[in-house]
């Protein structure tokens, strides 16, 4: 009679993770008499995944009835596949001895691969607000996938960026891989609405990227730009003097009026207006009594944008000029107060 | 004094080009966002493009993509239209406007004409 | 494209009386940022428009109280309480919340 051989079919399975893998084997013969043992891995580090005779392998199910007599398929299943999971598995034909059983025959092994998705992407920009015309650097991690290809790609608005380094690791094989990009972005004033997304794409995902995304508003600091302009006069001896304060983000600006480098006024920004593109209006208006100044009154708007240093604005108030003849430089527009420019 | 004066127009045959500019002065330029909107020979207004104060977002009408370019020199405080493949659908007053304090158009030019006609 | 329609296309007055205009989006104007960005110019004739009122109830700086801008939605109006001769000439509401930005058709304010 022939030896007994123990034929594994597949060289290799593919196994997406948390489905059921199933590793065939069989023999050609009843005898010898002894269990069937799976390992993965050869060698004396090599792991049992099942023994037949004994033991409690929760994950582990067989194809057949092992305990009829002519039973020659030795498959098994394996539950809840992951990445861990990867390896060769050799179907392992022991022969009944005293007081162990010893190894008769091995089958040439199937290779286990798992295919993993990736995590769900990962963005994260800089620690630290930055202003328009700076690059700022943003960077995407994702985990846990096999094999190993993967794609990664960043866009701006829908607008593909370029400028990105990306590195998979680890470098040789591995049960599973992590994929780290670092992308380089250049800040506009337009930005607060903007948004970088870190776009993935590994066969496990079926066409179908994993996208992260961050929000350019939370790395964002656009600075604002100040007008002083002086009213047409309210009274005879008053002058209404306004600051707007435009195109800011974020919304936190606390401004000072300064007459003639004395502080006069304090206050926070609190009823803004906010932009289309997503910054933000505020204007402030100083009521200055000329009859109280005998010179010329320097007043200055200073503003203090997100605890960065003050930025300031200044206007000239000609005390010795007739009030009236204090033109209005540019067109400003009723803010909610009850005060009216003259038509 | 806060103004944009337009300069530019003319007469040009259909197919052709013409670059149109807008001088700004009395404000900060650069820290306005800019559109140029357009009067037909019936009177109607038309909104042909946007620009904002550092030119990072641009818009069009439907009507002028592709065929117009709005562009701005901040240093020279200018906005131009560069306007290619004219029609005579194209045949207008252009005037250069500011977008304000509440993003209405505050300031207006007081126009350029542009005809286009064979 | 937002569709700005409105009506009366020529409305004729007496001085003193008080003169209404409609103005009908073809979908709501409300920007994504809560504002709607609705104005209201007058071109006199020769000139250049001028802005009357913005964000649909807001009088611009130097516009005299007698102008008022209410609505909300796709329901617009502008109401002058008392036309006076230099409040004659072309009207037209505009929708700045949706990019292409549009102009309704006119509406022009004459004496009776």
């Known amino acids: 009679e022939e030896e007994l051989q123990v034929i594994q079919p597949d060289k290799s399975v593919l196994v997406a993770a948390g489905e059921t893998a199933t590793l065939r084997c069989t023999a050609t013969s009843l005898i010898p008499v002894g269990p069937i043992q799976w390992f993965r891995g050869a060698g004396p580090g090599r792991e049992l995944i099942y023994n037949q005779k004994e033991g409690h392998f929760p994950r582990v199910t067989t194809v057949s009835d092992l305990t009829k007599r002519n039973n020659m398929d030795f498959s098994i299943r394996i539950g809840n596949i992951t990445p861990a999971d990867a390896g060769t598995y050799y179907c392992v034909k022991f022969r009944k001895g005293s007081p162990d059983d010893v190894e008769f025959k091995s089958g040439a092994g199937t290779e286990l691969s798992v295919r993993a998705k990736p995590s769900a992407p990962v963005v994260s920009g800089p620690a630290a607000r930055a202003t328009p015309q700076h690059t700022v650097s943003f960077t995407c991690e994702s985990h846990g996938f096999s094999p190993r290809d993967i794609t990664l790609k960043w866009f701006k608005n829908g607008n593909e960026l370029s400028d990105f380094q990306t590195n998979v690791d680890p470098v040789g094989e591995s049960v599973s891989y992590s994929i780290h990009s670092t992308a380089k972005v250049v800040l506009t004033r337009e930005d607060v609405h903007s948004q970088v997304i870190c776009e993935v794409a590994h066969v496990t995902l079926q066409g179908d990227p994993l996208r992260g995304t961050a929000n350019l508003s939370e790395t964002i600091r656009v600075p604002p730009t100040l007008e002083v302009t002086q009213q047409p006069v309210r009274a005879e001896n008053q002058v209404n003097v306004t600051c707007q304060v435009r195109k800011f983000y974020p919304q936190r600006l606390q401004l000072t009026w300064l007459e003639n480098g004395n502080v006069s006024r304090t206050e926070t920004a609190s009823t803004v207006t906010e932009n289309k593109d997503g910054t933000y209006n505020w204007m402030s208006w100083l009521l200055v009594n000329v009859s109280a100044h005998r010179d010329d009154v320097k007043l200055t708007c200073q503003v203090e944008h997100d605890g960065q240093p003050a930025v300031s604005k200044s206007h000239d108030l000609k005390v010795s000029a007739h009030p009236k003849e204090q033109g209005s430089n540019t067109a400003a527009e009723n803010t909610g107060s009850n005060e009216r420019n003259i038509y | 004094e806060v103004q944009v004066v337009e300069s530019g127009g003319g007469l040009v045959k259909p197919g052709g080009s013409l670059k149109i500019s807008c001088a700004a002065s009395g404000f900060a330029f650069s820290s306005y966002d800019m559109s140029w909107v357009r009067q037909t020979p019936e009177k109607r207004l038309e909104w042909v493009a946007y620009i904002s104060s550092g030119g990072g977002s641009i818009y069009y009408a439907e009507t002028v993509k592709g065929r117009f370019t709005i562009s701005r020199d901040n240093a020279k405080n200018t906005l131009y239209l560069q306007m290619s493949s004219l029609k005579s659908e194209d045949t207008a007053m252009y005037y250069c406007?500011?977008?304000?304090?509440?993003?209405?158009?505050?300031?207006w030019g007081a126009g350029t004409t542009v005809t286009v006609s064979s | 494209d937002v569709l700005m329609t409105q009506t009366p296309l020529s409305l004729p007055v007496s001085l003193g009386d008080q003169a209404s205009i409609s103005c009908r989006s073809s979908q709501s104007i409300v920007h994504s940022n809560g504002n709607t960005y609705l104005e209201w110019y007058l071109q006199k004739p020769g000139q250049s428009p001028k802005l009357l009122i913005y964000?649909?109830?807001n009088r611009f700086s130097g516009v005299p109280d007698r102008f008022s801008g209410s609505g909300s939605g796709t329901d617009f109006t502008l109401k002058i309480s008392r036309v006076e001769a230099e409040d004659l000439g072309v009207y037209f509401c505009?929708?700045?919340?949706?990019?292409?930005?549009?102009f309704g058709g006119g509406t022009k304010l004459e004496i009776k």
């Open positions: 505009f929708q700045g919340s949706h990019f292409p930005y549009t």
């Open positions: 406007v500011r977008h304000g304090y509440h993003e209405y158009f505050d300031v």
């Open positions: 964000k649909v109830s």
